[in-house]
Amino acid sequence: RGVFRRDAHKSEVAHRFKDLGEENFKALVLIAFAQYLQQCPFEDHVKLVNEVTEFAKTCVADESAENCDKSLHTLFGDKLCTVATLRETYGEMADCCAKQEPERNECFLQHKDDNPNLPRLVRPEVDVMCTAFHDNEETFLKKYLYEIARRHPYFYAPELLFFAKRYKAAFTECCQAADKAACLLPKLDELRDEGKASSAKQRLKCASLQKFGERAFKAWAVARLSQRFPKAEFAEVSKLVTDLTKVHTECCHGDLLECADDRADLAKYICENQDSISSKLKECCEKPLLEKSHCIAEVENDEMPADLPSLAADFVESKDVCKNYAEAKDVFLGMFLYEYARRHPDYSVVLLLRLAKTYETTLEKCCAAADPHECYAKVFDEFKPLVEEPQNLIKQNCELFEQLGEYKFQNALLVRYTKKVPQVSTPTLVEVSRNLGKVGSKCCKHPEAKRMPCAEDYLSVVLNQLCVLHEKTPVSDRVTKCCTESLVNRRPCFSALEVDETYVPKEFNAETFTFHADICTLSEKERQIKKQTALVELVKHKPKATKEQLKAVMDDFAAFVEKCCKADDKETCFAEEGKKLVAASQAALGL
């Protein structure tokens, strides 16, 4: 029952150009190229995109023209391999060009860099941005796509088109406003934060598909869509899952034109069939395509249908469970996950997947036992501790968050995670712990029924960031173990890690704790990052330091920064007071 067109096209590139239109075609090819060749200058990419676009137009005019029958991977790969500086800029990635498709594309995918060595994007003055926008709107927006795509090589391409549309709207509106900055800056901040979140969410989907396979992704999708569309029947959910899996497989595989086209088809199908899917889709379906797709992806859960009987009858109490399981394994387990998820919008997706895995494991064991029914009769009792563990963890951490506030809560997590995995680089520990800490303000405000899906599924996204960053430069067996053993048990695995007793404390380096007057001109966020970087380094030097010791040092540090930033001769203050602070801290921590 897939919605996607199966008819063969003589020219795939012509087909996609006609389906998507020139503007979206060019934008998606630019995103694809920037996600593959992350170091190439903007102008080089624009040139390549223009060449591909001109070629596509010749194929639209005549699908039988030379090379028009080639696959998109062949066409795009050939184009990427024309880049003159490939070996100098990308090193061994140039070897991909010696391969044939599909190995060449797989090779490019393997070289995508989650943490490319690119300068931080600095936002120019508002007037400068507005001038650039008015001077050449098209180039300005292309540059936005390019800069985001190269820094986020797994960004969900059709969603990036939606962000670009909002980016354009912000400039169109605000560059005419009386107070341009007041209008524009909050919008850009919102787009930046939403963009980072969107990128991280998509990165988890791609990791799920690439590291754990299609079955893992489909299980995640069944659980999530069943929560979101509890009135939809199993066949409908299964169909949506199949189509959604195809869309994300394509995007994660670099097939961005197919992905965007299929996503549009899926949105169309959902809106044409909303009566049998969800009562919450009406507003989404009235929007234009990009907004519609985004809206559907974020739509709130529909109300649970009335009259749902207990699951125990079919999945525990029946003596025919093993027969049903043996003869229709995937349907039976899929139905179990669907039925459980639609009844539990209050559970995280990862918890639902743990329950389904526990159920499957129990059936595997019990259906081979002498008395299967007696063996599996108490399977739902095994769920209780699995449900209570995240509930208790969230309760404790929300209490801590409410007591400390976001910054100090992040600090508590920084200390906790540095002690667990001190080998991980300081920037990664700071970034990940700061994001973990944001769970407080994101989720603790919710009522009990919404806390777990908010918190634990968000933590899965953040811990995946740690996993992909660590995979690039592996330094900790414990991180590797938690990241690779089970996708759904990553969070419990990290939660269960205690202090790493094998860690040899880092040598003390005074330079790490030397600060200068430039800290005073930083934004509050940047200042926090500086302090949190110092905190991680402290813990790496003294992993056995108590909370109280660390708090005392950090309080002294905050007072030191505040004092020197108020001083007339800031640099002298930082030099002299800094030495005293380092000495006092060493004494306090017994370094």
Epitope: E233, F234, A235, E236, S276, D307, L308, P309, S310, A312, A313, D314, F315, E317, S318, K319, D320, K323, N324, E327, A328, V331, F332, M335, E339
Partner: antibody, heavy 120, light 108 residues
């Protein structure tokens, strides 16, 4: 509109065969266990059997051998094949939808029924 | 397979009366019992499932209770439209299901 419509009933001679159909609209049969229930004139409800979402059919002890349930998902229809019919098989035959794909009950959705008369 | 015994098989009552119908299973079926109402020429209508859960749209004068082997359907105050035949159904112990033989409720 979500509904079930039975058809194929009628007069049949003892020893004869009949195939009843139950066409579903407004939902997909493949998501549910689909049941056949009968009721002889002025008598109790009697469950015949069902076919579940895994395409596994189960029958009441008395129905095994003579009655076969199948379905065609593309036609969104479930069937009841009845062989070696006897006078005591005279009844209104209902099709009913289970609560889930592997459910034996409860049945919230029923068809209006089709009358089967076995007589010479 | 288990059997369900419904009692009484027939019952006469007046509008406003409180009526109780019982259903006994030959073995424990936990809470897996449903109650149906059937009127002549119509299919059964689900009233109660899982022994005590009221189906949406069914008046609250209908209630169910019990678990294991003994179950009851109670109509707290009979209304004219309640005169019909009531069936219990046990399910969930296997992939088969059983109906009781009905209680015919008539006007006194």
């Amino acid at each position: 509109e979500v509904q079930l419509v039975e058809s194929g009933g009628g007069l049949v001679q003892p020893g004869g065969s009949l195939r009843l159909s139950c066409a579903a609209s407004g939902f997909s049969l493949s998501s549910y266990a689909m049941n056949w229930v009968r009721q002889a004139p002025g008598k109790c409800l009697e469950w015949i059997g069902h076919i579940n979402a895994g395409d596994i059919a189960y029958y009441a002890t008395w129905a095994k051998g003579r009655f076969t349930i199948s379905r065609d998902n593309s036609k969104n229809t479930v069937y009841l094949q009845m062989n070696s019919l006897r006078a005591e098989d005279t009844a209104v035959y209902f099709c009913a939808r289970g609560a889930g794909g592997f459910s034996t009950g409860p049945f919230k959705l029923w068809g209006q029924g089709t009358l089967v008369t076995v007589s010479s | 397979a288990f059997e369900l015994t419904q009692s009484p098989s027939s019952l006469s009552a007046s509008v406003g009366d409180r009526v109780t119908i019982t259903c006994q299973a030959s073995e424990s079926i936990n809470s897996r019992l449903a109650w149906y109402q059937q009127k002549p020429g119509q299919p059964p209508k689900l009233l109660i499932y899982d022994a005590s859960d009221l189906t949406s749209g069914v008046p609250s004068r209908f209630s169910g209770s019990g678990s294991g082997t003994d179950f009851t359907l109670t109509i707290s105050s009979l209304q004219p439209e309640d005169f019909a035949t009531y069936y219990c159904q046990g399910y969930g112990g296997s992939s088969t299901t059983t109906f009781g033989c009905g209680t015919k409720l008539t006007v006194l």
